[in-house]
């Protein structure tokens, strides 16, 4: 959860007008040291912050992407990095700032007039593209709202889960992403023990459905760490 990285996140937000603790994440009882900034103008936010650890783009803000901070760095150490502006180099759509997408390794403007054909090419030709850029406000809203009338069915190529029909999620399959079924109660799920570990999966499972969480199967508690089976279980 977010609390696990609070201590490494050095944003210091000032107390809110209602006098409570920082609203997201944390509370009066769980805010980590350094989150609240004492004194001063309460409507000022100090924006010099340390990088936020992440495992995938979806954990970062809409103007960020998740990657190793150093070229060729350890895949397990990833942080949220500022998105790349137009004409900067990229490897996938999520790296480009809102209003842009990744075309032939360069962030280009997502001009609606020629975007449809290009994005369809890019989905099929790119390595691990995670998100498209469709408008100036949010590059990670659904593809279907702009270009497709129907949501992707099981096996359809997708960029993110909102491209898929209800009950499906967008998950990695070899080096592209396709719509796969959201996991049901009792189905085996993947619990990532360390940040960044699911960047290595080439057959990614969906997450557990609503009301379910990925937990160790009760009769596997005695098994060794490496062989523990996780299944989707009711909260």
């Amino acid at each position: 959860t977010l609390n696990s990285v609070l201590n490494s996140n050095a944003i210091k937000n000032l107390p809110p007008p209602l006098g409570g603790a920082a609203g997201h994440p944390g509370s009066a009882v769980s805010a980590a040291p350094g989150i609240l900034y004492p004194g001063g103008n309460k409507y000022q936010t100090i924006d010099n912050y340390q990088p936020y650890p992440c495992a995938e783009d979806e954990e970062c803000g809409t103007d960020e992407y998740c990657a190793s901070p150093t070229r060729g760095g350890d895949a397990g150490v990833q942080i949220c990095l500022a998105c790349r502006k137009r004409r900067k180099r990229c490897m996938r759509h999520a790296m480009c700032c809102p209003g842009n997408y990744c075309k032939n390794g360069i962030c280009v403007s997502s001009d609606q007039n020629h975007f449809r054909g290009e994005i369809e090419e890019t989905i099929t030709e790119s390595f691990g593209n995670d998100h498209s850029t469709l408008d100036g406000y949010s590059r990670r809203t659904t593809l279907s709202s702009k270009m497709y009338h129907t949501k992707g069915q099981e096996g359809s190529v997708c960029l993110r889960s909102s491209d898929c029909a209800s009950g499906l999620c967008c998950a990695r399959h070899f080096w592209s992403k396709i719509c796969k079924p959201v996991l049901k109660e009792g189905q085996v799920c993947t619990k990532h023990r360390r940040k960044g570990s699911h960047g290595l999966e080439i057959f990614q499972r969906c997450y557990c459905g609503e009301g379910l969480s990925c937990r160790i199967q009760k009769d596997h508690h005695q098994a060794s760490n490496s062989s523990r089976l996780h299944t989707c279980q009711r909260h």
Partner: nanobody, 125 residues
């Protein structure tokens, strides 16, 4: 501009469950952090839980961890708060709020720029 409307509140016995919904109008919802706050009579409004734009990051106040679950469906422009094992001290007006999620960081309460009108949750003993 995002308008938020909460629903699903009501009267429930201690130990029971409720599911609150927060339905948004406006395209900015899918790019927003969504948070739930609550305010009990005579008390300050307090943070309950929050979820980032994609649903990949969530956080909970210690008082509700393990009992409450936040989720969202961007296709339906809706966020949910599943509340179980309810206690009398959970009685409050529950507010849904949304704010910009451009950067992965902590939001203070005043940075939630859109707020719903609230829905009453009463837990009887």
């Amino acid at each position: 501009e995002v308008q938020l409307v909460e629903s699903g509140g009501g009267l429930v016995q201690a130990g029971g469950s409720l599911r609150l919904s927060c339905t948004a109008s406006g395209s900015a919802f899918s790019s927003s952090v969504v948070g739930w706050f609550r305010q009990a009579p005579g008390k300050e409004r307090e943070f309950v839980t929050a979820i980032n734009w994609s649903g990949a990051r969530t956080d909970y106040a210690d008082s509700v961890k393990g009992r409450f679950t936040i989720s969202r469906d961007n296709a339906k422009n809706t966020a949910y708060l599943q509340m179980s094992s309810l206690k009398p001290e959970d009685t409050a007006v529950y507010y849904c709020a949304a704010g910009s999620d451009r950067y992965a960081r902590v939001l203070t309460e005043y940075e939630y720029v859109w707020w719903g009108q609230g829905t009453q949750v009463t837990v009887s003993s």
